[in-house]
Interface confidence: medium
Amino acid sequence: FERTRSLQDPCSNCPAGTFCDNNRNQICSPCPPNSFSSAGGQRTCDICRQCKGVFRTRKECSSTSNAECDCTPGFHCLGAGCSMCEQDCKQGQELTKKGCKDCCFGTFNDQKRGICRPWTNCSLDGKSVLVNGTKERDVVCGPSPADLSPGASSVTPPAPAREPGHSPQ
């Protein structure tokens, strides 16, 4: 028992929010201001992320967890953990290296970020265009022309609901 205890790393007893202080006989010291340790047994605390400028603080740093940032209005997060802020564009635009550009005819973007995507090709599904697309909105596909022939229902009946967890028969 004594031998096992002497082999055990004394730092392993230091909980999150502290570090094992070599300068003080390996006692557990609290993380200094603006630093944190998210796991036990740490020999140092990590510096808190600072959300400056175009970044703003979403969650304050604590002794056990890093700060989390998001972006100031007019920008949106990119990358893991919001590592970058990218400029918003208007709906109907996409961001290029030249700046925000209107979507080309036949494409749309209904968000302030991302790229312009082609309108849905209704005819691929045998449907017709019910509502034309715009730079901001996709086309709305309606029933195929055949479905609109006299006597045909203009509403497609819903497919039978499947029980969750069951494969289609």
Epitope: G53, V54, G99
Partner: antibody, heavy 123, light 107 residues
Framework: EVQLVQSGAEVKKPGESLKISCKVS????????IGWVRQMPGKGLEWMGI????????RYSPSFQGQVTISADKSISTAYLQWHTLKASDTAMYYC????????????????WGQGTLVTVSS | DIQMTQSPSSLSASVGDRVTITCRAS??????LNWYQQKPGKAPKLLIY???SLQSGVPSRFSGSGSGTDFTLTISSLQPEDFATYYC?????????FGQGTKVEIK
């Protein structure tokens, strides 16, 4: 090092034409907008227009549309501001500036400026 | 065009003073607001972009805040080299427009 070096001061008469230049170095000329800003004596800053040298796309402030022409020569990394018919009211300092646009770090901003070209139009 | 209004148009201050300049936009410009410093006979220099982001190499005594229509440039402790004219600029829409400038003079 990014540098924008403008042509020297000009003294002209009303009715004459003029083309001033802004030669850039230290970055890819075709990848950034270049803007022109006017500052009349003792006055504030006025944005005139910008050009994207990569494809010569040009945008003007309505106040300067038709009054000046902005152009660029990719082969010598130089942007130009031109007047066909100068007026006394064109007397001002003119600055070119790299338009650090649409970056991941911020909004469209002018982060590097030329030293300015003083244009004096007087009879 | 979006109108930018700065106040005051001029102010006198002493070295070490805290100085605040405000800028108001005629419509919401989100965070698309830049601050420039200009000294006599020199080109403007970018200080702050996106309302509150400090441009690389600019001393930390300069700070910016605000969003929407109301913005502030603060110099926490005025230094001799800070006596200059300061301009705000909106870059939300074309054409980007500048405020009329605030001249910071020695008291």
């Amino acid at each position: 090092e990014v540098q924008l070096v403008q042509s020297g001061a000009e003294v002209k008469k009303p009715g004459e034409s003029l083309k001033i230049s802004c030669k850039v170095s230290g970055y890819s000329f075709t990848n950034y907008w270049i803007g022109w800003v006017r500052q009349m004596p003792g006055k504030g800053l006025e944005w005139m227009g910008i050009i994207y040298p990569g494809d010569s796309d040009t945008r003007y402030s309505p106040s300067f549309q038709g009054q000046v022409t902005i152009s660029a020569d990719k082969s010598i990394s130089t942007a130009y501001l031109q007047w066909h018919t100068l007026k006394a009211s064109d007397t001002a300092m003119y600055y070119c500036a790299r338009h650090q646009g649409y970056s991941f770090s911020g909004s469209h901003i002018d982060d590097y400026w030329g030293q300015g070209t003083l244009v004096t139009v007087s009879s | 065009d979006i109108q930018m209004t700065q106040s005051p148009s001029s102010l006198s201050a002493s070295v070490g003073d805290r100085v605040t300049i405000t800028c108001r936009a005629s419509q919401s410009i989100s965070s698309y607001l830049n601050w420039y410093q200009q000294k006599p006979g020199k080109a403007p220099k970018l200080l702050i972009y996106a309302a509150s982001s400090l441009q690389s190499g600019v001393p930390s005594r300069f700070s910016g805040s605000g969003s929407g229509t109301d913005f502030t440039l603060t110099i926490s402790s005025l230094q001799p080299e800070d006596f200059a004219t300061y301009y705000c600029q909106q870059s939300y829409s074309t054409p980007p427009t500048f405020g009329q400038g605030t001249k910071v003079e020695i008291k």
